[in-house]
C-alpha cells in the first residue's frame, strides 16, 4: 500500500506498482500562522483519518468542476502557505526569521 499522503496511480494484483503524491489538497490544510517567522512553532499531527493527504502544488490540479466560481486552486506562495502534515510524529517547524 501507499504511504499516507500518496495514492496508487498504477496497481497490479493485490499490490501497488506506482504510488504518487495525492494530487488534491484536502480542505483542512494548515495555513502558516502570521507570527511563524518570529518564533519556533510545533504542530501536533492530527488524528489518523483527519490528516490532509496532499500535494500542495498539484501540477495538473484544476479549479472546481462544480458550479461555485469563487473557489480556486491558485496558491500565492507569499501570502498563504499550505503544509502537508505527516501522520507519525509531531513536526517542529523552526524559522530562521527570514
Amino acid at each position: 500500500e501507499c504511504r499516507p499522503g500518496m495514492i496508487c496511480a498504477t496497481s497490479a494484483t493485490n499490490s501497488c506498482a506506482r504510488c504518487v503524491p495525492y494530487p488534491i489538497c484536502a480542505a483542512e490544510t494548515v495555513t502558516k500562522p502570521q507570527d511563524m517567522a518570529e518564533k519556533d512553532t510545533t504542530f501536533e499531527a492530527p488524528p489518523l483519518g483527519t490528516q490532509p493527504d496532499c500535494n500542495p502544488t498539484p501540477e495538473n490540479g484544476e479549479a472546481p468542476a462544480s458550479t461555485s466560481p469563487t473557489q480556486s486552486l491558485l496558491v500565492d506562495s507569499q501570502a498563504s502557505k499550505t503544509l502537508p502534515i505527516p501522520t507519525s510524529a509531531p513536526v517542529a517547524l523552526s524559522s530562521t526569521g527570514k
Epitope: S11, Y22, E62, P64, A65, S68
Partner: nanobody, 121 residues
Framework: QVQLVESGGGSVQAGETLRLSCTAS????????MAWYRQAPGNECELVSI???????YYTDSVKGRFTASQDNAKNTVSLYLKSLQPEDTAVYYC???????????????WGPGTQVTVSS
Amino acid sequence: QVQLVESGGGSVQAGETLRLSCTASGFTFDGPDMAWYRQAPGNECELVSIISADGRTYYTDSVKGRFTASQDNAKNTVSLYLKSLQPEDTAVYYCAADPRRNCRGNCCGNWGPGTQVTVSS
C-alpha cells in the same frame, strides 16, 4: 453500506465522446473524494481522475484536456465526460469512493462493477 454503480459505457469510434456516470448509495458525495480508475484487459489498473468534495479535479496526463469530471451532489452522482476517445482508452472504467483510504486488489477505493468502454479506430 457503500454501493457504487457505473453506467454510460459503450462502443464508439475514435474521436467520439461518451459520458460515464457513477451513482452512489450508502453515503453522500459531500464527504470523500471520488476517483475514476480504468483497467484494460491484461493491464494494470490506472488512476484516471479524482474529483474532490468541493469540486477540485485531477487528471492523469494521458487524458488531460480530453476527459472532464463533474459531480451532482444533489443526485449523488459523479460523471466523467470522455471526448476525443482513442483506441488506447479502451478499458473497464470504475468509480471509486475515498481512494486514499481504501486500497486493495486491482483498484483503490470502494468501487462498483465498472462500465466497459471500447474505442475502435
